[in-house]
């Protein structure tokens, strides 16, 4: 049985200051190390305890990093992406895509499958509309009594 996972996808600019032990996270992905099927993007695989990213608190394991200091991370070899981070300087600006899972299904590990899903608003808008129609109908019914 195939499950379905829906995601709320948001983007955020995260500015980190390199700490004594660096930025404090690990990455997976790249054209030679696809982490998500049909996606050679760069993903955060581990946030290190007490590192700069952990202390900042915004970067999360599973986030996709779109750019570093304005430089796009598309179509990079894994090691080239690593080197880009290592040479990014003291102040590092990350453009990050967060994926908030809003519904669980019987699927495999997130990141090792298909990340596609439907945005939450596509679920919430029809539900909200139905609720409003039902409320309106109920009020009309009460007025007729």
């Amino acid at each position: 049985m195939n499950g379905r996972v829906d995601y709320l996808v948001t983007e955020e600019e995260i500015n980190l200051t390199r700490g004594p032990s660096g930025l404090g996270f690990n990455i997976v992905g790249g054209t030679d190390q696809q982490y998500v099927s049909n996606d050679s993007g760069i993903y955060v695989s581990r946030i290190k305890e007490n590192g700069a990213a952990a202390l900042d608190g915004r970067l999360q394991e599973g986030d996709k990093i779109l750019s570093v200091n304005g430089q796009d991370l598309k179509n990079l070899l894994h090691q080239d992406a690593v080197d880009l981070f290592r040479n990014a300087g003291y102040a590092v600006s990350l453009r990050v895509q967060h994926r908030l899972q809003v519904q669980n299904g019987p699927i495999g590990h997130r990141g090792e499958g298909d990340p596609s899903g439907i945005p939450i608003f596509m679920v919430l808008v029809p539900v909200f509309a139905l609720t409003m129609v039902a409320a309106w109908a109920f009020m009309r019914y009460r007025q007729q009594l």
Epitope: L23, V28, R86
Partner: nanobody
Framework: EVQLVESGGGLVQAGDSLRLSCVAS????????MGWFRQAPGKERDFVAA????????YYEDSVKGRFTISRDNAKNTVYLQMNSLKPEDTAVYYC?????????????????????WGQGTQVTVS
């Protein structure tokens, strides 16, 4: 995280060889940088060798260079440590360790804190 199980330890004579294996399960092995550490009784856990996710880079502790070889087979989810010309001072519990992904910081492969998954260890005794 990945689960790691070591095997291949045992009791050997000085000058003999052993090959340790570490089998991984639970997550895609090829995303992991792998390392071997050892701990002698009453001592700290020390770095022995490490290998990058692709196998393209290897690192060794000075005292084992030329005697030990780390390798991996991503198709078999296994990392190996070939130990030749064993010495009594190689006696220890040998641990396999995995680091999920590549650090974006300067990589210190000898730092146990770089690794997030550990095996239970296998005893190597050289008499």
């Amino acid at each position: 995280e990945v689960q790691l199980v070591e095997s291949g330890g045992g009791l050997v004579q000085a000058g003999d060889s052993l090959r340790l294996s570490c089998v991984a399960s639970g997550r895609t092995f090829s995303y992991y940088g792998m390392g071997w550490f050892r701990q002698a009784p009453g001592k700290e856990r020390d770095f022995v060798a490490a290998i990058s996710w692709s196998g393209g880079s290897t690192y060794y502790e000075d005292s084992v260079k030329g005697r030990f070889t780390i390798s991996r087979d991503n198709a078999k989810n296994t990392v190996y440590l070939q130990m030749n010309s064993l010495k009594p001072e190689d006696t220890a519990v040998y641990y396999c360790a995995g680091a999920f992904g590549s650090t974006v910081d300067n990589y210190d492969h000898s730092d146990p804190r770089e690794y997030d998954s550990w095996g239970q260890g296998t005893q190597v005794t050289v008499s």
